[in-house]
Interface confidence: low
């Protein structure tokens, strides 16, 4: 909230890329290097985001828009506007407090990020397992056992379902 000082606030005339400089009788001064204002009438410019360390610059800062960062190879973005970079793991793994760990039996992860998720329980849909699951891949469910000819059934005990979002430490 910025108070309007008068019916014609001099600051309201300051365009994006400038700030209303009270030290200079409220004239519109250009944003100094490494800062920006994305809207008009601003009393300050915002400091440009610096993409340092594990962050790398995806878009340079300009006087009217902030820099945008992404992550260096081996890391991926988390949070709004890539506020964090998290270490990648291999497929078949998940990131725990102790680093990348293989998915437990009965779970899989087909990405370099995120947690291991339980294999699909084919029997809940009245289907059978057509292709067994691995650490990297979910099971493939096929027709129901009744639809299969004798001897063709592939039986894998379903993995106990895990709370979503739970990550084994």
């Amino acid at each position: 909230f910025e108070r309007t000082r008068s019916l014609q606030d001099p600051c309201s005339n300051c365009p994006a890329g400038t700030f209303c400089d009270n030290n200079r009788n409220q004239i519109c001064s250009p944003c100094p290097p490494n800062s920006f204002s994305s809207a008009g009438g601003q009393r300050t410019c915002d400091i440009c985001r610096q993409c340092k360390g594990v962050f790398r610059t995806r878009k340079e800062c300009s006087s009217t828009s902030n820099a945008e960062c992404d992550c260096t190879p081996g890391f991926h973005c988390l949070g709004a506007g890539c506020s964090m970079c998290e270490q990648d793991c291999k497929q078949g793994q998940e990131l725990t407090k102790k680093g990348c760990k293989d998915c437990c039996f009965g779970t899989f992860n087909d990405q370099k990020r995120g947690i291991c998720r339980p294999w699909t329980n084919c029997s809940l849909d009245g289907k059978s397992v057509l292709v067994n699951g691995t650490k990297e891949r979910d099971v493939v469910c096929g027709p129901s056992p009744a639809d299969l000819s004798p001897g063709a059934s592939s039986v894998t005990p379903p993995a106990p379902a895990r709370e979503p979002g739970h990550s084994p430490q």
């Epitope: 909230f1 108070r3 200079r24 100094p32 009393r43 300050t44």
Partner: antibody, heavy 121, light 107 residues
Framework: QVQLVQSGAEVKKPGSSVKLSCKAS????????INWVRQAPGQGLEWMGN????????NYNQKFKDRVTLTVDKSTSTAYMELSSLRSEDTAVYYC??????????????WGQGTLVTVSS | DIQMTQSPSSLSASLGERVTITCKAS??????LSWFQQKPGKAPKTLIY???RLVDGVPSRFSGSGSGQDFTLTISSLQPEDIATYYC?????????FGGGTKVEIK
């Protein structure tokens, strides 16, 4: 690291002038305003004025307008405050302190150690 | 010039006690207010700016609140190192003006 180092104590006669210095180091001198604030013995703080070294733009407290002159020497990263027509009530510790470019996010983040000016006949 | 009235001018509190200092501006200053701490023989140190933004490195027991004309500095649990004089400063308009100060002592 950032430092503002001020000149030593001064004893002056009423009616004379004093020129204090504030030498900056550890940062880009031209990018921060230098403010001067004084504090009479046992009293509160009083803002006297500020200067932007990059272009020597100044603001003065009207109370001191006719007696204070702020200048900078960019080559030595030094700010100066001259106070003329001294009177006994000008006896005070004078501080220089910096604020960054954006007035409305002003933070006096670094201060000099202060210079005691005593005005006595 | 905008007048800043600070109260109390001094206070005595026990260690661990909550301490509150107030500052009232003679006109609306939005949120453009800083709080300073000054120890004897030392330069002031900025604690808070924009009424409630804590300066990096300042302990979280310090907090600021308010906008418009009425502002408060709170020390949630007084520590021995907090013994000092505290000043508010408005910078909504030039010239910036300070409150008269509040001297905080141990009871």
């Amino acid at each position: 690291q950032v430092q503002l180092v001020q000149s030593g104590a001064e004893v002056k006669k009423p009616g004379s002038s004093v020129k204090l210095s504030c030498k900056a180091s550890g940062y880009t001198f031209s990018s921060y305003w230098i403010n001067w604030v004084r504090q009479a013995p046992g009293q509160g703080l009083e803002w006297m004025g500020n200067i932007y070294p990059s272009d020597s733009y100044t603001n003065y407290n009207q109370k001191f307008k006719d007696r204070v002159t702020l200048t900078v020497d960019k080559s030595t990263s030094t700010a100066y405050m001259e106070l003329s027509s001294l009177r006994s009530e000008d006896t005070a510790v004078y501080y220089c302190t910096r604020t960054w470019e954006f007035y409305y996010d002003s933070v006096f983040d670094y201060w000099g150690q202060g210079t005691l000016v005593t005005v006595s006949s | 010039d905008i007048q800043m009235t600070q109260s109390p001018s001094s206070l005595s509190a026990s260690l661990g006690e909550r301490v509150t200092i107030t500052c009232k501006a003679s006109q609306d200053i939005n949120s453009y207010l800083s709080w300073f701490q000054q120890k004897p023989g030392k330069a002031p140190k900025t604690l808070i700016y924009r009424a409630n933004r804590l300066v990096d490195g300042v302990p979280s027991r310090f907090s600021g609140s308010g906008s418009g004309q009425d502002f408060t500095l709170t020390i949630s649990s007084l520590q021995p190192e907090d013994i000092a004089t505290y000043y508010c400063l408005q910078y909504d308009e030039l010239p910036p003006t300070f409150g008269g100060g509040t001297k905080v002592e141990i009871k």
